[in-house]
Amino acid sequence: AWELTILHTNDVHSRLEQTSEDSSKCVNASRCMGGVARLFTKVQQIRRAEPNVLLLDAGDQYQGTIWFTVYKGAEVAHFMNALRYDAMALGNHEFDNGVEGLIEPLLKEAKFPILSANIKAKGPLASQISGLYLPYKVLPVGDEVVGIVGYTSKETPFLSNPGTNLVFEDEITALQPEVDKLKTLNVNKIIALGHSGFEMDKLIAQKVRGVDVVVGGHSNTFLYTGNPPSKEVPAGKYPFIVTSDDGRKVPVVQAYAFGKYLGYLKIEFDERGNVISSHGNPILLNSSIPEDPSIKADINKWRIKLDNYSTQELGKTIVYLDGSSQSCRFRECNMGNLICDAMINNNLRHTDEMFWNHVSMCILNGGGIRSPIDERNNGTITWENLAAVLPFGGTFDLVQLKGSTLKKAFEHSVHRYGQSTGEFLQVGGIHVVYDLSRKPGDRVVKLDVLCTKCRVPSYDPLKMDEVYKVILPNFLANGGDGFQMIKDELLRHDSGDQDINVVSTYISKMKVIYPAVEGRIKFSTGSH
């Protein structure tokens, strides 16, 4: 028997520095978690103690904090090289700055293989990107070899900016021939490492013959055996065992997100490469694990540029950006309109000739808008200004919801109107009319939404049974501010880009902004 230790991360999302327990900015260092300096300490400790160790990342290192905004992926290559990762799978967010934004800072600089078997380059890109990422890699580990085969969500064209010269194939269809190839090369221990979400991870374990272990990402799934050590609630045991169609027990793992945990899986193989046993748990990277001093010093050195960036002008506003709670929790506010317009703009993807865009709607809880921006400061808008407006370090995500769920959400928006509560929704691509004389649950008298399958966008009445794509804060997707119906009824949820980054990019692109209050939200008075 031969034992392999798989250490794994996924969906780190630019959390190079330690964070608070909820993965936002670290405030009280004695209670902070994660970060590459602490991760390095734990990885080195395990490497010293155990003979056959692989450190793997399942994608989405990109996007999530000012680190990515400023360094654009160079920080990922630098610190992953420093930690001596053995392999990484491409996630959807690795394409956020286009293919160039992946090739130059990461693919060309990484000293470890970057993998995806289901992404195929075509046209002029094929030769440019050739060899920079691979479908699989055979890694020597001790006296043995292990095959790592990569995969990436086929939804990436809807979630990021991979351009028109990359084709995202079905994961299972693409993986099988690559695994078969590894088998012909006498590689009998194969790990599928990828970024398509827990449901696809389980399908890969079930359907792809020859895959021994699946290490996944994208869905931020937390698995744990026993009493979990922090706030995350396990979606199942670690590892999650799937019985494959050919009768094998295949362990599937994921390690939540944001570098808070280091996945730790021990696999025992027999001499024919069959998994005999698998066990482990994610390791919580809390303050009991010291930060490595040399990595920490390097982080501090890179940090300097971030502080300078946050006071630089991104663009100008020539109007007052009303982000006051007196406005945004009671009526349409132009800060809400600005943010929603930025959210839609960030999700422009012309992937189908029938659609001008795949998504037209945005909702945003008014309580998430925490500050106005005064235009009388020469109109200057900085990252620092935006951090006061959006201080929670959330993401703007893509969900699919039925019209009936959206209707419930808008009813919830005004169910206790007048109490300055945060659930009042700001919108984009939506025209809503409320009648507050009606009873809670029956106050939405008109709800029109902007068409997507049209060449000239126009507003049509919401259809209860139709499925709509909506951009919203992850806070709402997770049921925050009482939007339980969104959490319970969403049909799909893909995490998006950092909220401040979305708005800052939009402002930089527009250069001068002047958002108005334009009748997206109206109130009518019936006879109730």
Epitope: H415, K439, P440
Partner: antibody
């Protein structure tokens, strides 16, 4: 003093349509929701649906495919139709007024009720 | 739909007793909770709205409390006319749903 008076057929065969009407006496019809609630023998209360003076309706999803509530504002009446009845629809059916309560009108409650109509479905 | 769970389903008490009935919602309903009293062969009567506000004409011995998911109806000193079945009802979100009822009987 607002009063609700209700009437309709009390004995039905399976697959027939239940039809009940409720008249509002001594009060305004607008500004309220007019509801139907039922109570099977020895059991609890189940909300069927409601209508306002403009004809806007809300139905219980569990009954929606079979229920129609309508209003005749000229007569200050509202009606319930429940199609394709079975023995499971045997119950006392109540009409009720649901009005805004308190100063802020967040809270609505059924503050006036009809006397109830016993409906039996039997072959 | 939101499930409303009432407990106990029945209780025996004497005149003058303090009686407490609880109602739990399957998810938060803020303060959108009403309490009704029903006597045999009669229509229900609204006692409490908005979890704690007494409907006009209802004796002050009836009181309600709670918010979110847990609610209580209290009768401070049970009177002979209070022997009946009591129902809680959540008002929002639609559809309104009732608890299973609590029957208060004479000991």
């Amino acid at each position: 003093q607002v009063q609700l008076q209700q009437w309709g057929a009390g004995l039905l065969k399976p697959s027939e349509t239940l039809s009940l009407t409720c008249a509002v006496y001594g009060g305004s019809f607008s500004g309220y929701y007019w509801s139907w609630i039922r109570q099977p023998p020895g059991k609890g209360l189940e909300w069927i649906g409601e209508i306002d003076h403009s004809g806007s309706t809300n139905y219980n999803p569990s009954l929606k495919s079979r229920v129609t509530i309508s209003v005749d504002t000229s007569k200050n009446q509202f009606s319930l139709k429940l199609s394709s009845v079975t023995a499971a629809d045997t119950a006392v059916y109540y009409c009720a007024r649901e009005g805004g309560l308190g100063e802020d009108y967040y809270y609505y409650g059924m503050d006036v009720w009809g006397q109830g109509t016993t409906v039996t479905v039997s072959s | 739909d939101i499930q409303m769970t009432q407990s106990p389903s029945s209780l025996s008490a004497s005149v003058g007793d303090r009686v407490t009935i609880t109602c739990r919602a399957s998810q938060s309903i803020s303060s959108y909770l009403n309490w009704y009293q029903q006597k045999p062969g009669k229509a229900p009567k609204l006692l409490i709205y908005g979890a704690s506000s007494l409907q006009s004409g209802v004796p002050s011995r009836f009181s309600g409390s709670g918010s979110g998911t847990d609610f209580t109806l209290t009768i401070s000193s049970l009177q002979p006319e209070d022997f009946a079945t009591y129902y809680c009802q959540q008002q929002y979100p639609l559809p309104p749903t009732f608890g299973g009822g609590t029957k208060v009987e004479i000991k």
